[in-house]
């Protein structure tokens, strides 16, 4: 449906304040180094702009793209070539190739300064002396770290702000009612943050059918009453909105997803017993309630697979016709009867099963060909099902932190040569796959385990992408999506590692780690042994617990001396002294 | 708009034969599993067969397995069911409807009436 003015259909169906919100993340994650207050100004101008076009869609400019529209004023920008250097090359481009510049250029990891919370008298006194200009900088303030962050649960996430601060700024005790509130967000944040990473990057690394495979796979496994005509359907919508939000187009996005979330609760029933909670809440709850809803339950009585995919005689024939619409069906039909399996394994399964009729509908007798493909799958699926019990069982025996440690100490063995914060950051994030799967029953572990091992490997890829050092890591990552994380796993030490120069400063520690939180402390520690390993990566197990041990005893130790700058130096000297003797460094 | 054109009923002594016939039009047949239902003279809708998406898996109600065979033909966008060993029992308005084992009212078409009596 063609709009005269696109801008004024836009603001039309979002109303102007999820329209500002949208455009200032939209900026925010395109020029993530802008202060605040510039942002805020090419926004306002947006935003007058556009009422213009709502009064007359004939008005000048109005007509344009949101894409030119946006470009241009982002050009508008006057430090743009001293902040971003070579992105300002970008404005010289014409749109759609302007877009696809910006795009390049997100940054993952930008160079900003942590988030460090006021004190909480402090933010309530700003949350009632400007509302809106508190929650502008939340919202600015995420988008610019997260430039992938997906900008319509962004809202929902600004909504669930706003709420907490009204409710809090109120109570007898501000800090007991605030404080585990923005905490929970926080972590929720960065977890949504991730899983929209890895669906951006399965888009724009793989395409559009790999991230159309996954959904169909995850949709089956939660709607697996609905026809494959409905899930198909979704698919389909659900692509187009992720493909929107992915590529920068977040009004358009917004407004699609609300169309999906419609959509859905219109035809709950054929799709799924599990929506009607979801579909009272208004709009954002909605979307973000759907997006997570459980799994209904299989329908009675479902036939053999093997019926459809192995027995008839008409497999090569239905294959033939539409390729990618029988791999759909047998993705469909297979995941909607396993819940327990993770959407990556159903993925693995799917290509064996288009691998093996490529092979075999060219063969002299098909049938005879495929008809053990079915055996092929148990080696596929006994892998993460064995390797997650190990895990599981490893992190009930040493609790997160060392669980954390023992993964730390795996993958700088495996790929030594990444930057020691992004060792820690992701082997923390994969350590906490033990707190968060470990605790389910045998039929959830897999999904909940692999697919968000998915996600924190990506976190690995993007974070690599940006600066590469490792051809292992390259590998992992660019060779197939689905088999990431089985690529990390069978990696074994790196033997051409040339170990790292010592360097006691590394190893030289001061009183204000006394001062930190446990969390802080214990990324410092594991800073210290992912350097440890990066020394020694011969270094045996029982060898750098030893060293970890000592180490966690001399902070204690000088945390509790009087003079506590005087015990980090002279103790340190010592305990590195006897490290260097205990590693042979 | 979906249509789903049900024929081949009829007037058949107990222990005979027929075979109905479903002709869908208006959505994208081999995109759907497909079931028959029933519904006997003062009685409720009763779920009789399905068949799934690419034809091969088929279930039935106990009342009527050994007896019926349902099976499709998506490059006709038609779906079958053999009557076979009928018995007085069986009488009843055969419908075709969309989905397995349809347990939300579904639009139905006309149906075809089959009548098993000597």
């Known amino acids: 449906d063609a709009h005269k003015s696109e801008v004024a259909h836009r603001f039309k169906d979002l109303g102007e304040e999820n329209f500002k919100a949208l455009v200032l993340i939209a900026f925010a994650q395109y020029l993530q180094q802008c202060p605040f207050e510039d942002h805020v100004k090419l926004v306002n101008e947006v935003t007058e702009f556009a009422k213009t076009c709502v009064a007359d869609e004939s008005a000048e400019n109005c007509d344009k793209s949101l894409h030119t529209l946006f470009g241009d004023k982002l050009c508008t920008v006057a430090t743009l070539r001293e902040t971003y250097g070579e992105m300002a090359d970008c404005c010289a481009k014409q749109e759609p190739e302007r877009n696809e510049c910006f795009l390049q250029h997100k940054d993952d990891n930008p160079n900003l300064p942590r988030l460090v919370r006021p004190e909480v008298d402090v933010m309530c006194t700003a949350f009632h002396d400007n509302e809106e200009t508190f929650l502008k900088k939340y919202l600015y303030e995420i988008a610019r770290r997260h430039p992938y962050f997906y900008a319509p649960e962004l809202l929902f996430f600004a909504k669930r702000y706003k709420a907490a601060f009204t409710e809090c700024c109120q109570a007898a005790d501000k800090a007991a009612c605030l404080l585990p509130k923005l905490d929970e967000l926080r972590d929720e944040g960065k977890a949504s943050s991730a899983k929209q990473r890895l669906k951006c990057a399965s888009l724009q690394k793989f395409g559009e059918r790999a991230f159309k495979a996954w959904a169909v796979a995850r949709l089956s496994q939660r709607f697996p009453k609905a026809e494959f005509a409905e899930v198909s359907k979704l698919v389909t919508d659900l692509t187009k909105v992720h493909t929107e939000c992915c590529h920068g187009d977040l009004l358009e996005c917004a407004d699609d997803r609300a169309d999906l979330a419609k959509y859905i609760c219109e035809n709950q029933d054929s799709i799924s017993s599990k929506l009607k909670e979801c579909c009272e809440k208004p709009l954002l709850e909605k979307s973000h309630c759907i997006a997570e809803v459980e799994n209904d339950e299989m329908p009675a009585d479902l036939p053999s697979l093997a019926a459809d995919f192995v027995e008839s005689k008409d497999v090569c024939k239905n294959y033939a016709e539409a390729k990618d619409v029988f791999l759909g069906m047998f993705l469909y039909e297979y995941a909607r009867r396993h819940p327990d399996y993770s959407v990556v394994l159903l993925l693995r399964l799917a290509k064996t099963y288009e691998t093996t009729l490529e092979k075999c509908c060219a063969a002299a007798d098909p049938h005879e060909c495929y008809a053990k493909v079915f055996d092929e799958f148990k080696p596929l699926v006994e892998e993460p099902q064995n390797l997650i019990k190990q895990n599981c069982e490893l992190f009930e025996q040493l609790g997160e932190y060392k669980f954390q440690n023992a993964l730390l100490v795996r993958y700088t063995k495996k790929v030594p040569q990444v930057s020691t914060p992004t060792l820690v950051e992701v082997s923390r994030n994969l350590g906490k796959v033990g707190s968060k799967c470990c605790k389910h029953p045998e039929a959830k572990r897999m999904p909940c385990a692999e697919d968000y091992l998915s996600v924190v490997l990506n976190q690995l890829c993007v974070l690599h992408e940006k600066t590469p050092v490792s051809d292992r890591v390259t590998k992992c990552c660019t060779e197939s999506l689905v088999n990431r994380r089985p690529c990390f796993s069978a990696l074994e030490v790196d033997e051409t590692y040339v170990p790292k120069e010592f360097n006691a400063e590394t190893f030289t520690f001061h009183a204000d780690i006394c001062t930190l939180s446990e969390k802080e402390r214990q990324i410092k520690k594991q800073t210290a042994l992912v350097e440890l390993v990066k020394h020694k990566p011969k270094a045996t197990k029982e060898q750098l617990k030893a060293v970890m041990d000592d180490f966690a005893a001399f902070v204690e130790k000088c945390c509790k001396a009087d003079d506590k700058e005087t015990c980090f130096a002279e103790e340190g000297k010592k305990l590195v002294a006897a490290s260097q003797a205990a590693l042979g460094l | 708009e979906v249509q789903l054109q049900e024929s081949g009923g009829g007037l058949v002594e107990p222990g005979g034969s027929l075979r109905l016939s479903c002709v869908a039009s208006g959505f994208t047949f081999q995109h759907y599993a497909m079931s028959w239902v029933r519904q006997a003279p003062g009685k409720g809708l009763e779920w009789v067969s399905s068949?799934?998406?690419?034809?091969?898996?088929?279930s039935y109600a106990d009342s009527v397995k050994g007896r019926f065979t349902m099976s499709r033909d998506n490059a006709k966008n038609t779906l079958y069911l053999q009557l076979n060993s009928l018995k007085s029992e069986d009488t009843a308005m055969y419908y075709c409807v969309r989905g397995w084992h349809p347990d939300v009212p579904r639009p139905l078409g006309q149906g075809t009436l089959v009548t098993v009596s000597s």
């Open positions: 068949i799934s998406i690419v034809g091969g898996g088929t």
